[in-house]
Interface confidence: medium
């Protein structure tokens, strides 16, 4: 079937974050996808708007990720831009109101972005084959 | 079908608080992929967008507004509120609630608005 | 911030005649552009959305076009009923609506 027009717009968001490097994409975020073994593809969607969610709550204004030039500071505005827009937009792919994230285990950002740019794509695939 | 009806006080004073409720009808608030926003219209001037409240609860404000701006969501109520604290003439205005988001994404445009509700701020 | 500028403020043309309208970007704001219309006493109503598509129940006379900074919406062939403001509004970061232009009738 037809791809949903938020999937693509989710590919087209990460494929911009994971461009760029930032001060603050080594930072740590929760690893939902270490063990996502039974979890349902809306409820990893969910989960993923969750932690980008409480990254970029906790450093839309923290100065360690603003930095000190005028560069690193318009970089880091358009990351936190870009991970609000993809907060929204897995969101709406997963159409539930809450769920739980509990996981101990921490991957940075760029690499959990990275991880699910692959889902992302895998999905993608599959829905325009 | 879906409708947004704005109510509050029509004259509010300067250094006052100004509380509008935008109640929806016709469907659920917490619907996604959907979100809910204020926008208004000076007298004379054009449209300026006041902030923003998303199904994750997340909120986004005008930068020039930011420091004065609340909005909320009841669900109970099927309602979302505008805040806008220490109101001076400027903010006379018809206030629009409108309804972000189409049925397969949310980062979209206003497709759905109230009638609009003019309050103006005097003494 | 990002500022959209849109031109002319107002213009005046006749039944029939081809209107055209431009927004400009103050960055690259890749198709995160929508058109409103505003009648006098009326809510907006959305017209264009992501530069160029075109809203459900919205005539065909009504187009968008344009990527990046520059951005135009056209009325192929003006109608009275078209007597209105038109306003480009950006999604890219955050929302910003344009100055408007006001459409009136020679």
């Known amino acids: 079937h037809k791809c949903d027009i938020t999937l693509q717009e989710i590919i087209k968001t990460l494929n911009s974050l994971t461009e760029q490097k930032t001060l603050c994409t080594e930072l740590t975020v929760t690893d939902i996808f270490a063990a996502s073994k039974n979890t349902t593809e809306k409820e990893t969607f969910c989960r993923a708007a969750t932690v980008l969610r409480q990254f970029y709550s906790h450093h839309e204004k923290d100065t360690r990720c603003l930095g000190a030039t005028a560069q690193q500071f318009h970089r880091h505005k358009q990351l936190i831009r870009f991970l609000k827009r993809l907060d929204r937009n897995l969101w709406g792919l997963a159409g539930l109101n809450s769920c739980p994230v509990k996981e101990a285990n921490q991957s940075t950002l760029e690499n959990f972005l990275e991880r699910l740019k692959t889902i992302m794509r895998e999905k993608y695939s599959k829905c325009s084959s | 079908q879906l409708q947004l009806q704005e109510s509050g006080p029509g004259l509010v004073k300067p250094s006052e608080t100004l509380s509008l409720t935008c109640t929806v009808s016709g469907g659920s608030i917490s619907s996604i992929p959907y979100y809910w926003g204020w926008i208004r219209k000076p007298p004379g001037k054009g449209l300026e967008w006041i902030g923003s409240?998303?199904?994750?609860?997340?909120?986004d404000y005008n930068p020039s507004l930011k420091s004065r701006v609340t909005i909320s969501v009841d669900t109970s109520k099927n309602q979302f509120s505008l805040k806008l604290s220490s109101v001076t003439a400027a903010d006379t205005a018809v206030y629009y609630c409108?309804?972000?988001?189409?049925?397969?994404?949310?980062?979209?445009?206003?497709?759905?608005w109230g009638q609009g509700t003019m309050v103006t701020v005097s003494s | 911030d990002i500022q959209m500028t849109q031109s002319p403020s107002s213009l005046s043309a006749s039944v029939g005649d081809r209107v055209t309208i431009t927004c400009q970007a103050s960055?690259?704001?890749?198709?995160?552009l929508n058109w409103y219309q505003e009648k006098p006493g009326k809510a907006p109503k959305l017209l264009i959305y992501d530069a160029s598509n075109l809203e459900t129940g919205v005539p065909s006379r009504f187009s968008g076009s344009g990527s990046g900074t520059d951005f135009t919406f056209t009325i192929s062939s003006l109608q009275p009923e078209d007597i209105a403001t038109y306003y480009c509004q950006q999604y890219y970061d955050l929302y910003t609506f344009g100055g408007g232009t006001k459409v009136e009738i020679k």
């Open positions: 409108a309804r972000g988001g189409a049925r397969d994404r949310i980062d979209h445009a206003f497709s759905i």
């Open positions: 409240i998303y199904p994750s609860g997340s909120t």
């Open positions: 960055q690259d704001i890749s198709n995160y």
